[in-house]
Interface confidence: low
Amino acid sequence: LEVQVPEDPVVALVGTDATLCCSFSPEPGFSLAQLNLIWQLTDTKQLVHSFAEGQDQGSAYANRTALFPDLLAQGNASLRLQRVRVADEGSFTCFVSIRDFGSAAVSLQVAAPYSKPSMTLEPNKDLRPGDTVTITCSSYRGYPEAEVFWQDGQGVPLTGNVTTSQMANEQGLFDVHSVLRVVLGANGTYSCLVRNPVLQQDAHGSVTITGQPMTFP
């Protein structure tokens, strides 16, 4: 029995619902009484949802899963996962048994966009060319871990003296803090770009230092 799932991971935003597609080709005369369907976590083999003996056996996964019962007879064994969390990320296997048996695994990639970075400067007054300043770029509640890039006003990448830390909160979302230590020129703009590698979403923050005063666009 051939079971088909998408090759590419299903990308779902945290808090939204995701559909993990799975289909099979029922033979003529097929009835749901013959169907055994199991969704499980590929790695741990934990049962997620099942259909057997003509009945939806329900969710074994925090009551957040559902089948499409009206579509099962047409060979649609897809699973709906509600209120996606970071912890849901991973591989789900769809097992279908009628007379023959088949299975396939689909990957769920969870994502959350990063907030617009906030920029802080230390010290933040009486700045002179030649002073060393610390610029902190903070962006919150994204997933997965971000890629952080710094550049100057001319678009030249700044890679030295950058320290980036990322810490997950209890939902598994990351807060990113990137610190750039730089020696001030006569004036300058420093930009931080926080990229979500899955969503290919960029969040920008910048600070312009003009001797005095400073501006935060």
Epitope: D43, T44, Q46, A87, G90, Q166, M167, E170, H177
Partner: antibody, heavy 118, light 107 residues
Framework: EVKLVESGAVLVKPGASVKISCKAS????????MDWVKQSQGKSLEWVGD????????TYNQKFRGKATLTVDRSSNTAYMELRSLTSEDSAVYYC???????????WGAGTTVTVSS | DIQLTQPPASLSASVGETVTITCRAS??????LAWYRQKQGRSPQLLVY???TLPEGVPSRFSGSGSGTQFSLKINSLQTEDLGDYYC?????????FGGGTKLEIK
């Protein structure tokens, strides 16, 4: 070297409050969560709660809500836990521990022994 | 809350032996499980996190395995310094909870 230095042992009377401290050195306090863990004599470990020093967000184990109050003083790189309305059940060693990215604990303080006795 | 059970409460083994300590979770914690050793009068020391990852400085004779609800910590070639209490801790969601501990004694 990353270290957490906790305040010394205390003996307090029932009904009183106590505030114990945990000074971080070798790293910046605000870069990591600070967690607190209770261990009663001869017993296992119980997570009390944690504080994110960057945003002062606090998560308590429901069991310790109303019993423990977590605070930080970023200027001195020090975290505090205040325990109130103490009873003999609160007699224990209290550890501070640095909450790593994945929420396990790599760096621990030596523990503060709190004894509640009249 | 997720309960972690560590049978047995104590075990003893001889130097050079291989010892396995187990931990069972009341619900799926995926691979979010850490192991600690606590020597008498000392703070706990992290041995394993994410079920099988050893932090820097932990001897390679320690190894962790398991996922979901069943986990184990294996100590190859037991040394005298390995005596103490061993605790598992899940780091899947708050409240983080610890197992009741397994006391390892050296014969």
């Amino acid at each position: 070297e990353v270290k957490l230095v906790e305040s010394g042992a205390v003996l307090v009377k029932p009904g009183a409050s106590v505030k114990i401290s945990c000074k971080a050195s070798g790293y910046t306090l605000s870069d990591f969560n600070m967690d607190w863990v209770k261990q009663s004599q001869g017993k296992s470990l119980e997570w009390v709660g944690d504080i994110n020093p960057n945003y002062d967000t606090i998560t308590y184990n429901q069991k310790f809500r109303g019993k423990a109050t977590l605070t930080v003083d970023r200027s001195s790189n020090t975290a505090y836990m205040e325990l109130r309305s103490l009873t003999s059940e609160d007699s224990a060693v209290y550890y501070c521990a640095r909450g790593e990215l994945g929420r396990y604990f790599y760096v621990w303080g030596a523990g503060t022994t709190v004894t509640v006795s009249s | 809350d997720i309960q972690l059970t560590q049978p047995p409460a104590s075990l003893s083994a001889s130097v050079g032996e291989t010892v396995t300590i187990t931990c069972r979770a009341s619900e799926n914690v995926y691979s979010y499980l850490a192991w600690y050793r606590q020597k008498q009068g000392r703070s706990p020391q992290l041995l394993v996190y994410n079920a099988k990852t050893l932090p820097e400085g932990v001897p390679s004779r320690f190894s962790g395995s398991g996922s979901g609800t069943q986990f184990s910590l294996k100590i190859n070639s037991l040394q005298t310094e390995d005596l103490g209490d061993y605790y598992c801790q899940h780091h899947y969601g708050t409240p983080w909870t610890f197992g009741g501990g397994t006391k390892l004694e050296i014969k």
